[in-house]
């Protein structure tokens, strides 16, 4: 018993002593945060000069405060001991960690391509202001029906068949029925109208095609090879749409 | 049946943290948005952030960004809250909200409403 | 103040119908889904109308919703007692990538 307490007692001498040895050591480790240890000075914990700042102790140096220039805008100051934070004007959004890049907003129903802001092609939609449009729902792989149409500012809803159901009560996640549902005359029209867009598609690249062969490959390559760029330009196009398909993927008051 | 149970209110001061946890039972947690929405008492409802299961995006009301921070541990099927630097104007009950339309079939949840609901806890900000 | 804009009060009589109207703008009710809330004295809110008009299984068929443009409105027919209580419309809002609740309307069943 007596040499259990005799060790207890002996590690935390030890380890007393090397804290105050640490310390008489390093005296840099004694500078709390928003202070550096200046060498040049006998190793006193200086402040940090105006726009720098320490967000630890015993650090031998400030860093440099963020500054938010620009489309960035300050959400909170640089003090001494943490760096200042930036957010995006008006009509942009923060991407990144930090927010260490501005991107454009667009309006519900657009997606930002490298020619700014384009209308959501038909059968996608986004209903934020960043972002991609994405296909519609597709309520029959879950076996539900159609209830609402989307937009290119929303997606379609999805509820029971309607013989599941009363009329207007639906239930919000219904249980999949287990046969498909029938091919309606919305969805043959539906894939006859893609049919003859992808003929149409084929008709354009095998013009697009010739034409490439007479001039010459340079053209076609850099439309390919030419970056994704996010612009910074505050002017919306409008004209068309993005076909692109991606992959799946305050108030006071009293009452 | 959907099961929402909300924890770690209490009593906290100005400047001070908190971090609030939701456990669910009864669905699938990780197909789903989940909301926090808080209410001060003799007040209304105000939406306070939302968190997607797919790809994780999380979006915040204007008095909250910067101090709150939602996050999932889809797991332990838990919804939590870290809340720093708490005003007075925090004090309120926070509940945990699931939101309807299950992903990643459906793509967007915001026509479905929140259609799950904790019975909320109590955070009280004084000094 | 609220983004969107509901009376702070309503009442009728049993048996009659109500309607509690919620204002918006392009930006949450003209673009987006309108949701309906019902919170009893004491209670979390329960979802009472999704997609503007359609009612959840449970939701009495005396509840129905409505939009037109950037407001909502719901209506609630052959009033009963236990229908007095606070309800809150609800919609995303794109420009502030958030959702956003009205003020709430306290119904009373006189």
């Known amino acids: 018993m007596g040499n259990s307490c005799y060790n207890i007692v002996a590690t935390l001498l030890l380890v007393l002593n090397f804290e105050r040895t640490r310390s008489l050591q390093d005296p840099c480790s004694n500078c709390p945060a928003g202070t550096f240890c200046d060498n040049n000075r006998n190793q006193i914990c200086s402040p940090c000069p105006p726009n720098s700042f320490s967000s630890a102790g015993g650090q031998r140096t400030c860093d440099i405060c963020r500054q938010c220039k620009g489309v960035f805008r300050t959400r909170k100051e640089c003090s001494s001991t943490s760096n200042a934070e930036c957010d995006c004007t008006p009509g942009f959004h923060c991407l990144g960690a930090g927010c260490s890049m501005c991107e454009q907003d667009c309006k519900q129903g657009q997606e930002l391509t490298k020619k700014g802001c384009k209308d959501c092609c038909f059968g996608t939609f986004n209903d934020q202001k960043r972002g991609i449009c994405r296909p519609w729902t597709n309520c029959s792989l879950d076996g539900k029906s159609v209830l609402v149409n989307g937009t290119k500012e929303r997606d379609v809803v999805c509820g029971p068949s309607p013989a599941d159901l009363s009329p207007g009560a639906s239930s919000v996640t219904p249980p999949a029925p287990a046969r498909e549902p029938g091919h309606s005359p919305q969805i043959i029209s539906f894939f006859l109208a893609l049919t003859s867009t992808a003929l149409l598609f084929l008709l354009f690249f095998l013009t697009l095609r010739f034409s490439v062969v007479k001039r010459g490959r340079k053209k076609l390559l850099y439309i390919f090879k030419q970056p994704f760029m996010r612009p910074v330009q505050t002017t919306q196009e409008e004209d068309g749409c993005s076909c692109r398909f991606p992959e799946e993927e305050e108030g006071g008051c009293e009452l | 049946e959907v099961q929402l149970l909300e924890s770690g209110g209490g009593l906290v001061q100005p400047g001070g943290s908190l971090r609030l946890s939701c456990a669910a039972s009864g669905f699938t947690f990780s197909g789903y948005d989940m909301s926090w929405v808080r209410q001060a008492p003799g007040k209304c409802l105000e939406w306070v952030s939302v968190?997607?299961?797919?790809?994780?995006?999380?979006y915040y009301a204007d008095s909250v960004k910067g101090r709150f921070t939602i996050s999932r541990d889809n797991s332990k099927n838990t919804l939590y809250l870290q809340m720093n630097s708490l005003r007075a104007e925090d004090a309120a009950v926070y509940y945990c909200?699931?939101?309807?339309?299950?992903?990643?079939?459906?793509?967007?949840?915001?026509?479905?409403?929140?259609?799950?609901w904790g019975q909320g806890t109590l955070v009280t900000v004084s000094s | 103040q609220s983004v969107l804009t509901q009376p702070p009060s309503a009442s009728g009589t049993p048996g009659r119908r109500v309607t509690i109207s919620c204002s918006g703008s392009s930006s949450n009710i003209g673009n987006n889904y309108v949701t309906w809330y019902q919170q009893l004295p004491g209670t979390a809110p329960k979802l009472l109308i999704y997609a503007d008009s359609h009612r959840p299984s449970g939701v009495p068929d005396r509840f129905s919703g409505s939009k037109s443009g950037t407001s909502a409105s719901l209506a609630i027919s052959g009033l009963r007692s236990e229908d007095e209580a606070d309800y809150y419309c609800a919609t995303w809002d794109y420009s502030l990538s958030g959702y956003v609740f009205g003020g709430g309307t306290k119904l009373t069943v006189l």
């Open positions: 909200a699931k939101h309807g339309g299950q992903k990643p079939t459906t793509k967007s949840s915001s026509a479905y409403g929140m259609d799950g």
């Open positions: 968190i997607y299961p797919d790809d994780g995006n999380t």
